[in-house]
Interface confidence: low
Amino acid sequence: AGSDSLYVPCAPSPCVNGGTCRQTGDFTFECNCLPGFEGSTCERNIDDCPNHRCQNGGVCVDGVNTYNCRCPPQWTGQFCTEDVDECLLQPNACQNGGTCANRNGGYGCVCVNGWSGDDCSENIDDCAFASCTPGSTCIDRVASFSCMCPEGKAGLLCHLDDACISNPCHKGALCDTNPLNGQYICTCPQGYKGADCTEDVDEGNSHHHHHH
């Protein structure tokens, strides 16, 4: 065999991944590896994940002389330490006028009166806490309730006696009950006036309301 067959350790270089070959003897060599690689020929990518700094459940993904963190959906950033602002990502996260409040690792909704639940989609049953008088019917509304009174009862909670029950208004007048105090209100027909619509008035005057 001629000189072509002579073994030259660094020609060609056995070092891979950018490693630099250095001849250390007639038949020996040493590879100086770039950061991130190891092994006699720099063939191994060093696992940079052990003792990684990924936080909040982030999963480490090894790279070349570095690592990256694969973050759960509510976290972001190089090391999963930055909170994702769900309120920006989901403008309609809170329903029915609720206000979105970003929090570490999630978000919360501040609901307007009458709504509840994680996304303010549940109408609070105001009748559960209402004090309609027994015998009346409670109707749930948004952030309020109303009481439907049985015959003879009046007021917001049906706790008052209905003053209209005794027909105090005369001459075809309309009788209404003041929901605050239970007193009757007569709406007089044309030509009549007075609390009970019993008094005549001059022609040309329109309807009169009288409270009692």
């Epitope: 936080q55 002389n65 190089q78």
Partner: antibody, heavy 117, light 112 residues
Framework: EVQLVQSGAEVKKPGESLKISCKGS????????IHWVRQMPGKGPEWTGY????????KFNEKFKGQATISVDKSITTAYLQWSSLKASDTAMYYC??????????WGQGTLVTVSS | DVVMTQSPDSLAVSLGERATINCRSS???????????LHWFQQKPGQPPKLLIY???NRFSGVPDRFSGSGSGTDFTLTISSLQAEDVAVYYC?????????FGGGTKVEIK
Amino acid sequence: EVQLVQSGAEVKKPGESLKISCKGSGYTFSNYVIHWVRQMPGKGPEWTGYIIPGSGGTKFNEKFKGQATISVDKSITTAYLQWSSLKASDTAMYYCARDGAGSFTYWGQGTLVTVSS
Amino acid sequence: DVVMTQSPDSLAVSLGERATINCRSSQSLVHSDGNTYLHWFQQKPGQPPKLLIYRISNRFSGVPDRFSGSGSGTDFTLTISSLQAEDVAVYYCLQSTHFPDTFGGGTKVEIK
């Protein structure tokens, strides 16, 4: 080439404030945690705490909690160690070091802090 | 905190001879991920520590092959197979398995 260059030596009086710096270059600054290590005269090194440059999140050795703060300015790839009120016992060499391979792979040259009345 | 105890405190070795430094931890350094985070550093006067060996036995880039590490669990060894004049320094072990990271007290290596 990875380099961490620290600010120069400081001589301070007890009660004074101080902020020392560590500028990283030659690598993606946000990709690596920066540690601060204290070495008191004639003693071995002590890990003080670290900062995550990407987020500014910090973690401290309980022994040093509340004594100093660590911050970062990503725009100039620089980490800081700061005291609001120095004590004589803070006299030491302070090193910054870059995280990697589960250890401290590259170190700054150190900043000597002397606190004396 | 995990206590790292190095021995001996100082060591005088002839040029070309073997130097052996021991490091013992107060608890096992085997991490839940299966790795052991025990590292060795060299520090020369007026210089910062320099990483020699990481995770028991892996030489850091540019570190001569006369430096080697071994051990497991709680007992670890740094060996300099043939001491050179430039190896005069203080050597520290460091564990980063358990929070917080803790260094050993150091071993001073001199030439006999």
